[in-house]
């Protein structure tokens, strides 16, 4: 039961995280005009990975896409790449994890296959989360650098009297969404990896003891009502040794707390 819960929770947390990464990537507010210690403007500028926008106090908003690839800063391209890789890996991870979920039965898929798929999706979620966190952090670092550069020459005097105000940009909402989403995806991935350990079959082979009764070839196997005819194919390494009421999920104990990244 604990494995199913851990796996299910990992899937849900990762799903929320990946939805957040997608949302952050699409959001326009990666950087927003810094309003602190600035003249009050009737125009508010904000920028995303794909377009820049201007919202006037009249309520009119105009957005312009970056219709160039070569003209964009390399850092911005890198951030775009990291976010897209994160989304792609996360989407594949979600697809794999759906089939790996213990609560979903697909044909005669073995537990070992489900364990492998759970581990694969977990690793994908971890890498996806790290890509998102890295992408957002690179962009944030870029903003901090530009912020202090523009602060150094915020007012560039022109002929003494006339001044040009340089627009400074600070962290937008998308950065926080990205950090949280990346963290959630990472946590979800870790949970999937933990769940994988519980799904993996044990190596020890518990041999059944056969009692031959006259006239019938019946193999009795301790472990509750798990008896079958001698022709059964129950030779796989299944944990049917325990006669207690516990399910196989409860055999292994797991840490109950996970550190948030």
């Amino acid at each position: 039961m604990a494995v199913t819960a851990c796996q299910g929770l990992g899937f849900v947390v990762s799903l929320i995280g990946i939805a957040g990464i997608i949302a952050a990537t699409c959001m326009d507010q990666w950087s927003t005009q810094d309003l602190y210690n600035n003249p009050v403007t009737a125009v508010f500028n904000y920028q995303g990975l794909w377009r820049s926008c201007v919202r006037e106090s009249s309520g009119f908003t105009e957005c312009r896409g970056y219709f160039t690839l070569l003209g964009l800063p390399a850092m911005l391209q890198a951030v775009r790449a990291l976010m897209i890789v994160g989304i792609v890996l996360g989407a594949i991870g979600l697809l794999v994890s759906i089939f790996a979920l213990k609560c979903i039965r697909i044909g005669s898929m073995e537990d070992s296959a489900k364990a492998n798929m759970t581990l694969t999706s977990g690793i994908m979620f971890i890498v996806s989360g790290l890509c998102a966190i890295a992408g957002v952090s690179v962009f944030a670092n870029m903003l901090v650098t530009n912020f202090w550069m523009s602060t150094a020459n915020m007012y560039t005097g022109m002929g003494g009297m006339v001044q040009t105000v340089q627009t400074r940009y600070t962290f937008g909402a998308a950065l926080f969404v990205g950090w949280v989403a990346g963290g959630l995806t990472l946590i979800g991935g870790v949970m999937m990896c933990i769940a994988c350990r519980g799904l993996a079959p044990e190596e020890t082979n518990y041999k059944a003891v056969s009692y031959h009764a006259s006239g019938h070839s019946v193999a009795y196997k301790p472990g509750g009502f798990k008896a079958s005819t001698g022709f059964g194919s129950n030779t796989k390494n299944k944990k049917i040794y325990d006669g207690g009421a516990r399910t196989e999920d409860e055999v292994q104990s797991y840490p109950s707390k996970h550190d948030y990244v």
Epitope: Q33, P39, V40, T41, A42, V43, N45, Q47, S52, C53, V54, E56, S57, S58, G59, F60, E62, R64, M158, V162, Q163, T164, V165, Q166, T167
Partner: antibody, heavy 118, light 113 residues
């Protein structure tokens, strides 16, 4: 057709109060930023105050800050200007205007006259 | 506050003449985000409320005759009337629409010669 009709002007003593109203029609009032602009007799235009749509941020000219309060009632499609501690220099025709692209004031009312005199 | 300086303060013009008036701001009205200048021109005829002519320094408002044109960037702006007509007699105001308070220039009065 866009219409802005001001009312509430009149003669008031210095230190007195007055509340101007502006009834808007012909456009989606709740989505528009609206402003008050005044013009003293024989003088130029002076921006007084602006209230934005949505969150309703308010902005005031330094000359009226702390004395005038702009507000809006989207349900009634109305804009208001509460004027307290009135001075002789507040005597003017007060125009209600709508903000447009570029923050330009594209529609103006006919104005309401405010006279502050003892 | 942003100071808007208009010149000349008044001008006598003959019909058909080309008119130019200037407006200077104490700070740049160019927004780096969209590369637009937040300067507006208005026309006010005697006894009437002002009328919007040009916004974003050079975009003509719908219904405004094409003889009116705006130009300039940053701090220096110009309103041009290509062929002055009798009905253009009015006071023309420029306005800073970038910084609060949204200041107006003192106006340029156009009279018929």
């Amino acid at each position: 057709e866009v219409q802005l009709v001001e009312s509430g002007g009149g003669l008031v003593k210095p230190g007195g109060s007055l509340r101007l109203s502006c009834a808007a029609s012909g456009f989606t009032f709740s989505n528009s930023a609206v402003s008050w602009v005044r013009q003293a007799p024989g003088k130029g235009l002076e921006w007084v105050s602006t209230i934005t749509s949505g969150v309703s941020y308010t902005y005031y000219a330094d000359s009226v800050k702390g004395r005038f309060t702009i507000s809006r009632d989207n349900a009634k499609n109305s804009l208001y200007l509460q004027m307290n501690s009135l001075r002789a220099e507040d005597t003017a025709v007060y125009y209600c205007t709508r903000q447009f692209k570029g923050n330009a004031l594209d529609y103006w009312g006919q104005g309401t006259s405010v006279t502050v005199s003892s | 506050d942003i100071v808007m300086t208009q010149s000349p303060s008044s001008l006598s013009v003959s019909p058909g003449e080309r008119v130019t008036m200037s407006c200077k701001s104490s700070q740049s009205l160019l927004n780096s985000g969209n590369q637009k200048n937040y300067l507006t021109w208005y026309q006010q005829k005697p006894g009437q409320p002002p009328k919007l002519l040009i916004y974003w320094a050079s975009t003509r408002e719908s219904g405004v005759p094409d003889r009116f044109s705006g130009s300039g960037s940053g701090t220096d702006f110009t309103l041009t009337i290509n062929s002055f007509q009798a009905e253009d007699v009015a006071v023309y105001y420029c306005q800073n629409d970038y910084f609060y308070p949204l200041t107006f220039g003192a106006g340029t009065k156009l009279e018929l010669k």
